[in-house]
Every structure is written in structure tokens, then in C-alpha cells.
């Protein structure tokens, strides 16, 4: 008998759900992995893939009703031949609460002395018309701004903001500003990820003079 | 008018710890910022960190890399800075300011922001 892999999970983002296992040892050339999914309710397993050579798989298109629905489970077993392992199962149900929160982009621009910023939610391809970011999580969008000033490594200023846009008075400041952006919503456990880094120039050019 | 007072300052180490606090009397601390600044043997002022009211809002010397950690407690008046992987060059007398206003902006960088100052607590960072 094969042995089983010793461990699997989800990586998602909002509709990015991806599949992870590790592979078993000694592993030969022909050994794969079989997929199966269960979604919570139906008590059912539908096989997935029969043989995956990689060690993950892009469950995106089969869960995406993963945001209105109980969640998932997922199995992988390998498979040389005709002999095959045990299934392992992911230790937890993939739900919403597992879901990685992302942002799309942000846009900088400077006006009259101020750093203004647009936070653009994730808009993923896969993503069914009506489930978008603001729509599954309608309420307590919740965003942490951190800034830096170029050169120099560390941030040195840090703001949360509850909605979309955010304004930074910069009293005379000049230099290149760089911001990043990590979402949350704080009714829920989800972790958020930082964005990159999105950098702007501010010049004298930038400020009105009045008197 | 609001009086500040800090606390914690002594002798460490280097690479060591210590924990700053700063309370506050009078006019109702919790609607202002508040922040710390510095001032090593024979330099002028610098700007350490500062916090909104609401605790939403951090600012940051560029020296601070990370090390150090600035919080306040409205409901007991105090202002802390959390001071971790003390350096020789941190060495100096640390004063508590309070300003006025909630914008975020880096005006709360600059000494001449603040209305209300503490008389100081001396910290040394020496084997």
C-alpha cells in the first residue's frame, strides 16, 4: 500500500481557491495524486482529478459558490499503477472564513498638498457578476494604510480607515511617498494580505500658495 | 490647559527594553494627539512617534525601524511608548506632547504642532 500524503490544505484568495499537498516519500516518476471534493450538505465525494502530477490543483471553478454556501472538503490520495493510498482529508472545512483578503489595486495621486488614495477590491475573472467584493462583504470593509517615505525602510505612518478612499495632508512634505494597503472586515477572522507597494513623488510643484 | 508627566526612563542595556508612560491631567486627553519626542546630549528636539485619539493613527521617526511601539489607555489618561532592541544612540531625555486636531498629516512629525509638553524622563542606553 502507498503511503498517504502526509498533509493537505487550501490557499485562496477571493476567488482563487487552490489546493495544496505534500508529496509522499519516495515518490516514483509514475505516482499522482487523485482529487475529490466534498461539498458540505450533499455527502457526497466527486472525484476532481484522477491524476495530478503537480502538488496542487485550482478548485476555483468547482467552489465557486464557496461564498454563499457551508463550505468544502477536500481529499488527495496517491496513485502508482494500480495500487493507491489512503485518502487524506484537509483538517478543516474551507469556508469563507478561510479565504486570504486581497485588494485589486491602489491609486495614488496628489492634490493641493494631500496624498489621495483609491483602494480598488479584488476583481477576479471567475468571479460571478453579482458576487462581487462589496457585495459578500457588505458591511465593516476595514482597511489599514501604511506609509513610508523614500528613502528609508520603515513605515512611519500607519492609519486603519473603514472605507475605500483615503486622504494624507502632507504640511510640506516632499519626497517620494509609498503606500501599502491591507484589507479586513471586522466582524470576520479572515486574514488580510498587504498589498504591494504603490509609490508616488511629491514635489513643491504639488502645493498652492495662499495667503 | 493639560499637564503632562512621564515615567519609566533608567539605565539599560543595549539590545534591552523599557516602557515609557506619560499621564495626563486636566482638559480631556482622549480628543487630542499625542505623541513623543526626544532630545539627545547637545542636538535639538526629534520627532519619535505620535498616536491619534482614537488609536487608529501611528506616526514614526525614521530611526524607530520598527523597534518601538506607541499606545495609549483614554481611560486612565496615558500615553506609553514601548522601546525594544535599545540602541547607545537612543540615549536622551524622551518628553510627551499633546496637539490639537485629527487630520491625518505629517504635521504631527514637527515639534511645532504641540501645545502641551511633559518636563521629561532621561533614558540611557549603556553597558
Known amino acids: 500500500e502507498l503511503p498517504s500524503p502526509p498533509s493537505v490544505w487550501f490557499e485562496a484568495e477571493f476567488f482563487h481557491h487552490i489546493l495544496h499537498w505534500t508529496p509522499i516519500p519516495n515518490q516514483s516518476e509514475s505516482t499522482c495524486y487523485e482529487v475529490a471534493l466534498l461539498r458540505y450538505g450533499t455527502g457526497r465525494w466527486n472525484s476532481i482529478s484522477n491524476c495530478s502530477q503537480a502538488l496542487s490543483y485550482d478548485l476555483t471553478a468547482v467552489t465557486l459558490d464557496l461564498y454563499r454556501s457551508n463550505g468544502y472538503r477536500a481529499r488527495v490520495r496517491a496513485v502508482d499503477g494500480s495500487r493507491h493510498s489512503n485518502w487524506t482529508v484537509t483538517n478543516t472545512r474551507f469556508s469563507l472564513d478561510e479565504v486570504t483578503l486581497t485588494v485589486g489595486s491602489v491609486k495614488l495621486e496628489i492634490h493641493n498638498g494631500f496624498i489621495l488614495g483609491k483602494i480598488q477590491p479584488p476583481r477576479p475573472k471567475m468571479a460571478p457578476a453579482n458576487d462581487t467584493y462589496e457585495s459578500i462583504f457588505s458591511h465593516f470593509r476595514e482597511y489599514e494604510i501604511a506609509i513610508r517615505k523614500v528613502p528609508g525602510n520603515f513605515t512611519f505612518t500607519h492609519k486603519k480607515v473603514k472605507h475605500e478612499n483615503f486622504s494624507l495632508l502632507t504640511s510640506g512634505e516632499v519626497g517620494e511617498f509609498c503606500v501599502q494597503v491591507k484589507p479586513s472586515v471586522t466582524s470576520r477572522t479572515n486574514k488580510g494580505m498587504w498589498s504591494k507597494e504603490e509609490c508616488v513623488s511629491l514635489t513643491r510643484q504639488y502645493f498652492t500658495v495662499t495667503n | 490647559e493639560v499637564q503632562l508627566l512621564e515615567s519609566g526612563g533608567g539605565l539599560v542595556q543595549p539590545g534591552g527594553s523599557l516602557r515609557l508612560s506619560c499621564a495626563a491631567s486636566?482638559?480631556?486627553?482622549?480628543?487630542?494627539?499625542v505623541g513623543w519626542f526626544r532630545q539627545a546630549p547637545g542636538k535639538g528636539r526629534e520627532f519619535v512617534s505620535a498616536?491619534?485619539?482614537?488609536?487608529?493613527?501611528?506616526y514614526f521617526g525614521d530611526f524607530v525601524e520598527g523597534r518601538f511601539t506607541i499606545s495609549r489607555d483614554n481611560s486612565k489618561n496615558t500615553l506609553y511608548l514601548q522601546m525594544n532592541s535599545l540602541r547607545a544612540e537612543d540615549t536622551a531625555v524622551y518628553y510627551c506632547a499633546a496637539a490639537t486636531g485629527q487630520v491625518w498629516s505629517l504635521q504631527y512629525l514637527r515639534e511645532s504642532s504641540y501645545a502641551y509638553w511633559g518636563q521629561g524622563t532621561l533614558v540611557t542606553v549603556s553597558s
Open positions: 498616536i491619534t485619539w482614537n488609536g487608529d493613527t501611528t
Open positions: 486636566g482638559r480631556t486627553f482622549s480628543s487630542h494627539t
